[in-house]
């Protein structure tokens, strides 16, 4: 008995070969002897029933001259899994067709962190093994269900599942979209008074996207977090529902999600969490955003540089006179110089020598007041 493996919804070709390599009479039947189709000597394909019943069954007329009389079954269904009989040259050939199906749990669009379950449906009597390969090359294998917990952004793309049965294999390709922001977290460094822009690009494109979102902000100076803005999303259209009076944020009216804070102030320094709830999805998308604000000031004989917001302990804060060595450098959030000499002073926030933020302040001779450029 010949075994043919097929995929639900696709086509399968069941072989039937003549030893004489020429056109001959043949008939394809179900195992209960019901006729499917055949050729009775006039080179014409005769179907065994009404067109609606047998429109999925066909043969390759072009192959008949070479002594090949395959049965083509289109739009395969699970119930097509059975034995088919080819009668030709006074002999019967049995061909077993097994139709398989691999599906993703409920939806192929899943939120980051959710689980993906791939399920194999197979005909009774079969004992296939299945192995699936993720877009980032990770292999998982198992029985009829395979699970991946904690989906990551790199899991977006085409998953390839190979079903193996009696040394024959059939390959399934399933497109999985992991719904997430491009970045889990971002940090913005600004001098006091500068305009701040927060961007929240999505890592996927969906034709119709509906949801609602909110930005909660925990200022370093505040005891509790505060909702800064709420908005709705419909396709690429963003509409603000509610915004705080202080700060007066502005939001872009189309994707990608984008917010503008008129100016960076110490009282705004801190961390925010933007959540986006998508229609018909359980759970939310999250992106963390951090704001670090720097201020350089001179009060009487004291030149001070301060930063507010979530800085890592390894960041260095320095005060230096332009083109000279740093006068003071500390892994702290405030540094100062007493009786600074006149000139252009620079306050620098740096990470392993790389400057993240810089603020200049001009110190005038002692009889004048400072000028901030």
């Amino acid at each position: 008995k010949t075994l043919v493996l097929g995929k639900e919804g696709e086509s399968a070709e069941l072989p039937c070969e003549s030893s004489q390599k020429k056109i001959t009479v043949f008939t394809w039947k179900f195992s209960d002897q019901r006729k499917i189709l055949g050729q009775h000597g006039k080179g014409v394909l005769i179907r065994g029933g009404s067109p609606s019943q047998f429109d999925r069954f066909d043969s390759k007329k072009g192959a008949w001259e070479k002594g090949s009389f395959p049965l083509i079954i289109n739009k395969l269904k699970m119930e097509d899994s059975q034995t088919y009989i080819c009668e030709l040259e006074n002999r019967k050939e049995e061909v077993e067709l097994w139709v398989f199906k691999v599906t993703a749990n409920s939806d192929t669009h899943l939120l980051q962190g959710q689980s993906l379950t791939l399920t194999l449906e197979s005909p009774p009597g079969s004992s296939p093994s299945v192995q699936c390969r993720s877009p980032r090359g990770k292999n998982i294998q198992g029985g009829k269900t395979l699970s991946v917990s904690q989906l990551e952004l790199q899991d977006s793309g085409t998953w390839t599942c190979t079903v193996l049965q009696n040394q024959k294999k059939v390959e399934f390709k399933i497109d999985i979209v992991v719904l997430a922001f491009q970045k889990a977290s971002s940090i913005v460094y600004k001098k006091e008074g500068e305009q701040v822009e927060f961007s929240f690009p999505l890592a996927f494109t969906v034709e119709k996207l509906t949801g609602s979102g909110e930005l909660w902000w925990q200022a370093e100076r505040a005891s509790s977090s505060k909702s800064w803005i709420t908005f709705d999303l419909k396709n690429k259209e963003v509409s603000v529902k509610r915004v705080t009076q202080d700060p007066k944020l502005q939001m872009g009216k189309k994707l990608p999600l984008h917010l503008t804070l008129p100016q960076a102030l110490p009282q705004y320094a801190g961390s925010g969490n933007l959540t986006l709830a998508l229609e018909a999805k359980t759970g939310k998308l999250h992106q963390e955003v951090n704001l670090v604000v720097m201020r350089a000031t001179q009060l009487q004989k004291n030149l001070t540089c301060e930063v507010w917001g979530p800085t890592s302990p390894k960041l260095m804060l320095s005060l230096k006179l332009e083109n000279k060595e740093a006068k003071v450098s500390k892994r702290e959030k405030a540094v100062w110089v007493l009786n600074p000499e006149a000139g252009m002073w620079q306050c620098l926030l740096s990470d392993s020598g790389q400057v993240l933020l810089e603020s200049n302040i001009k110190v005038l001779p002692t009889w004048s007041t400072p000028v901030q450029p």
């Epitope: 305009q195 690429k236 259209e237 509409s239 872009g252």
Partner: antibody
Framework: EVQLLESGGGLVQPGGSLRLSCSAS????????MSWVRQAPGKGLDWVSS????????YHADSVKGRFTISRDNSKNTLYLQMSSLRDEDTAVYYC???????????WGKGTTVTVSS | AIQMTQSPSSLSASVGDRVTITCRAS??????LGWYQQKPGKAPKFLIS???SLQSGVPSRFSGSGYGTDFTLTISSLQPEDFATYYC?????????FGQGTKVEIK
């Protein structure tokens, strides 16, 4: 071919009311943001109002807030601008405009003239 | 509201000249900026979206650039049919705001 045709303009006294209409054809009207933009004689373009086809949300310029109302009838493929408490400075050519998929005003009507004068 | 400042307000140029018009936003608007051309007595014509994306049917001598607050419309070689008034529009947020316009006249 996408077409927009404004109507309803005319001469009206200060404090009076007027309703402008914009008849749309050649596209799926309900899918798009529609807007009104005006231009006073010898002046530049001035955005007046927009309405979303998807959400029905409406947006108005501060200068017309509380006096003008934008609305749409998707079954009739028509956009409206109800103008009340009209002032001299509302005298302008009023254009109806359609947004594209990227939310830019890509197609404009020929305009209808509104004159506010006593 | 976001203010759009266009400059110059008018300019005189000859056919074949390279013309540059600038538009400055009072705050960052990423690249959410459009350019329009208007001839006397006519409706505005959409030229450029997303600061630099040329609309179909618009000649390639028109180009746009910029991001954030500063934007430019350039006509590489001015043609007789290009004499018109040009407007920038910020499409970042409502209220939508136009620049005051730049009139390109024949020298």
């Amino acid at each position: 071919e996408v077409q927009l045709l404004e109507s309803g303009g005319g001469l009206v006294q200060p404090g009076g009311s007027l309703r402008l209409s914009c008849s749309a054809s050649g596209f799926t009207f309900s899918d798009y943001v529609m807007s009104w933009v005006r231009q006073a004689p010898g002046k530049g373009l001035d955005w007046v109002s927009s309405i979303s086809g998807l959400t029905g949300n409406t947006y108005h310029a501060d200068s017309v807030k509380g006096r003008f109302t934008i609305s749409r009838d998707n079954s009739k493929n028509t956009l409206y601008l109800q103008m009340s408490s009209l002032r001299d400075e509302d005298t302008a050519v009023y254009y109806c405009a359609k947004d594209n998929e990227d939310y830019y005003m890509d197609v404009w009507g020929k305009g209808t003239t509104v004159t506010v004068s006593s | 509201a976001i203010q759009m400042t266009q400059s110059p307000s008018s300019l005189s140029a000859s056919v074949g000249d390279r013309v540059t018009i600038t538009c400055r936003a009072s705050q960052g608007i990423r690249n959410d900026l459009g350019w329009y051309q208007q001839k006397p007595g006519k409706a505005p014509k959409f030229l450029i979206s997303a600061a630099s994306s040329l609309q179909s049917g618009v000649p390639s001598r028109f180009s746009g650039s910029g991001y954030g607050t500063d934007f430019t419309l350039t006509i590489s070689s001015l043609q007789p049919e290009d004499f018109a008034t040009y407007y920038c529009l910020q499409d970042y947020t409502y209220p939508r705001t136009f620049g005051q316009g730049t009139k390109v006249e024949i020298k």
